[in-house]
């Protein structure tokens, strides 16, 4: 058993049917010695007496809040959370994994050291999250994260809807122009009722870069059905742009066609590469769509920014 | 060329070649679900690789003040990787295909390093560690680690040359 925070303890339990359970000693935080009784929010009536209560924890009924009393007065509380281990593997039941088998998905719109991580939950009830740097070595990268919040968007996976939580983090000391040598290491602690789980991830900022879409997409008619389409770097992208350059993929989106956000890199079927912020295209109907990607490192591409082929005269 | 005494390199040529290096580095190791070898332990294999760090003057301000520090660091890295790609790690089994991106990458690393340092002028270079894995799968894991590290290195170098070409070219 170890202390998660004041008066909250995590008990690591072997979740196999014939496991003996974990023996836990709870001590009442009081100078009193006599006439102390114990209750649990999971069971009826008095469950023990004495300054120290010894219990065997093997199921969720054994978790929860234990309170010691004397003569009708509450002396102290101890809250027990269970961390399940089955066949040597820690449980991962609170979060739902994304398509690529990861539980935490982090993205950065630029190289400033600011990034957002998100995760999906199976059931949005009685949840508490805490995300922090998981590496304690002196040369590790320190990160400060805010509070996790529930996103408005729901995510559908395998025909089921999941709630999405997000958190913003910022690396304490950043050097956007350097080559990263140590990854950022994060741990997410998740609590649901009396269950405790932890999840970890490790990444370089360069690998989680996902630019925002190009902005100010505009059309200028040329001859026949040729148009010049132009755009600008997104405001959130790192500067100067002569140093932090983007490349762009341009695609004609036919009417009724949906633009897919793929997991397999930007160079989608039918898209062509442009390094400037304008190009000429043949555009008869539908939309012209543009997405951005770091010019020199193949991290994720932005969402598509689209503009109708019709040119307002 | 970054000639002795610190005159400017051919920024535009360096920009073009470093951008080609980025493309080749990704063709050499695309980082997708094909990497099916069980993940290796973090053995000390590519720790001696020269990295472009914060104090190396490779940021826009540092390049404006004196690009030589940064160019020297880039040159050092190019030579280091060029030697690694020419070592047993890449020449051993499984052997490289004749027209492979890795082969072109090796040649381009040499090409860019020569653009930065003409004959007769020598910047200090770093020794490459003597790594000679006996098993092909160990060699493959090392290749992947080296190429992944090279992708990050050439991305920073390409940014430096792109910025130099845009702002420091005479």
């Amino acid at each position: 058993m170890w202390e998660l925070e004041k008066d909250v303890y995590v008990v690591e339990v072997d979740w196999t049917p014939d496991a003996p359970g974990e023996t836990v000693n709870l001590t009442c935080d009081t100078p009193e010695e006599d006439d102390i009784t114990w209750t649990s929010d999971q069971r009826h009536g008095v469950i023990g007496s004495g300054k120290t209560l010894t219990i065997t924890v093997k199921e969720f009924l054994d978790a929860g809040q234990y309170t010691c009393h004397k003569g009708g007065e509450t002396l102290s509380h101890s809250h027990l959370l269970l961390h399940k281990k089955e066949n040597g593997i820690w449980s991962t039941e609170i979060l739902k994994n994304f398509k690529n088998k990861t539980f935490l998905k982090c993205e950065a719109p630029n190289y400033s050291g600011r990034f957002t991580c998100s995760w999906l939950v199976q059931r949005n009830m009685d949840l508490k999250f805490n995300i922090k740097s998981s590496s304690s070595s002196p040369d590790s990268r320190a990160v400060t994260c805010g509070m996790a919040s529930l996103s408005a968007e729901k995510v559908t996976l395998d025909q089921r809807d999941y709630e999405k939580y997000s958190v913003s983090c910022q690396e304490d000391v950043t050097c956007p122009t350097a080559e990263e040598t140590l990854p950022i290491e994060l741990a997410l602690e998740a609590r649901q009722q009396n269950k405790y789980e932890n999840y970890s991830t490790s990444f370089f900022i360069r690998d989680i870069i996902k630019p925002d879409p190009p902005k100010n997409l505009q059309m200028k008619p040329l001859k026949n059905s040729q148009v010049e389409v132009s755009w600008e770097y997104p405001d959130s992208w790192s500067t100067p742009h002569s140093y932090f350059s983007l490349k762009f993929f341009v695609r004609i989106q036919r009417k009724k066609e949906k633009m897919k956000e793929t997991e397999e890199g930007c160079n989608q079927k039918g898209a062509f590469l442009v390094e400037k912020t304008s190009t000429e295209v043949q555009c008869k109907g539908g939309n012209v769509c543009v997405q951005a990607q770091d010019r020199y490192y193949n991290s994720s591409c932005s969402k598509w920014a689209c503009v109708p082929c019709r040119v307002r005269s | 060329r970054a000639v002795p005494g610190g005159s400017s390199p051919a920024w535009t040529q360096c920009q073009q070649l470093s951008q080609k290096l980025c493309t080749l580095a990704w063709s050499a190791h695309p980082l997708v679900g094909h990497m099916d070898l069980r993940e290796e332990g973090d053995e000390e294999t590519t720790n001696d690789v020269p990295h472009i760090q914060c104090g190396d003057g490779c940021d826009p301000q540092g390049l404006r003040d004196n690009s030589q520090f940064c160019l020297q660091r880039i040159h050092q890295g190019l030579i280091f990787y060029e030697k690694l790609l020419g070592s047993d790690i890449f020449t051993g089994e499984p052997s490289l295909l004749p027209d492979s991106p890795v082969g072109q990458l090796h040649a381009s690393l040499l090409g860019l390093s020569q653009l930065l340092q003409p004959e007769g002028h020598h910047w200090e270079t770093q020794q490459i560690p003597s790594l000679s894995p006996s098993q092909p799968w160990q060699r493959l894991l090392l290749r992947f680690k080296i190429l992944r590290s090279l992708q990050a290195f050439v991305a920073v170098a390409a940014r430096v040359f792109a910025h130099g070409a845009a702002t420091l070219s005479p």
């Epitope: 397999e264 890199g265 160079n267 | -």
Partner: antibody, heavy 120, light 107 residues
Framework: QVQLVQSGAEVKKPGASVKVSCKTS????????ISWVRQAPGQGLEWMGL????????NYGQKVQGRVTMTTDTSTSTAYMELRSLRSDDTAVYYC?????????????WGQGTMVTVSS | EIVLTQSPDFQSVTPKEKVTITCRAS??????LHWYQQKPDQSPKLLIK???QSISGVPSRFSGSGSGTDFTLTINSLEAEDAAAYYC?????????FGQGTKLEIK
């Protein structure tokens, strides 16, 4: 994830041609090559040849040399294998597999196979 | 071309038994030998690459050894689901070649 999806089964007459497609997804097509392997009913595996999607280079096995053409269409991330002058011993399941373009490697990802039957 | 000869061609075994399949190359191929498993009406699946390197997702009872011309695939404690054909494959030089296969039947 990486997937190779092949075209459906074909029935052909001797002397005809067949063109099997292999549509890839989940990775950057031009960073890999495609090998073609076939398997006659109840028989073992036979390598037919390979094509690099990176530079279009091909290498064909001796048994099908002169009758086979392997191509790629990078705009649709699809590889094709055309076999001409079909004979009854070309009846087989044809598989496409991903091929490393940097060094000779194992075949880690396979298509589901396309049954080609040559019969008069 | 390099000829790969597998033995045995066929083997009938009981569950929990240890199975050994060998593959001999007509000339030296270093460690560029790979093993595949093929179940009826399925595509082959990579089990071992470069003679001895295990693949993620493949049960640890499958192991490989050898180099040069003689190679072995070992299945420790055979399970019913291991009934399949097993092929060796060399990628040392073109044309790539496969062994003729070993069919494993569970008694």
């Amino acid at each position: 994830q990486v997937q190779l999806v092949q075209s459906g089964a074909e029935v052909k007459k001797p002397g005809a041609s067949v063109k099997v497609s292999c549509k890839t997804s989940g990775y950057t097509f031009t960073y890999y090559g495609i090998s073609w392997v076939r398997q006659a009913p109840g028989q073992g595996l036979e390598w037919m040849g390979l094509i690099s999607a990176y530079n279009g280079n091909t290498n064909y096995g001796q048994k099908v040399q002169g009758r086979v053409t392997m191509t790629t269409d990078t705009s649709t991330s699809t590889a094709y294998m055309e076999l001409r002058s079909l004979r009854s011993d070309d009846t087989a399941v044809y598989y496409c597999v991903t091929e490393n373009i940097n060094w000779r490697d194992a075949f880690d990802i396979w298509g589901q196979g396309t049954m080609v039957t040559v019969s008069s | 071309e390099i000829v790969l000869t597998q033995s045995p061609d066929f083997q009938s075994v009981t569950p929990k038994e240890k199975v050994t399949i060998t593959c001999r190359a007509s000339q030296t191929i270093g460690s560029s030998l790979h093993w595949y498993q093929q179940k009826p009406d399925q595509s082959p699946k990579l089990l071992i690459k470069y003679a001895s390197q295990s693949i993620s997702g493949v049960p640890s009872r499958f192991s490989g050894s050898g180099s040069g011309t003689d190679f072995t695939l070992t299945i420790n404690s055979l399970e019913a689901e291991d009934a399949a054909a097993y092929y060796c494959h060399q990628s040392s030089s073109l044309p790539y070649t496969f062994g003729q296969g070993t069919k494993l039947e569970i008694k």
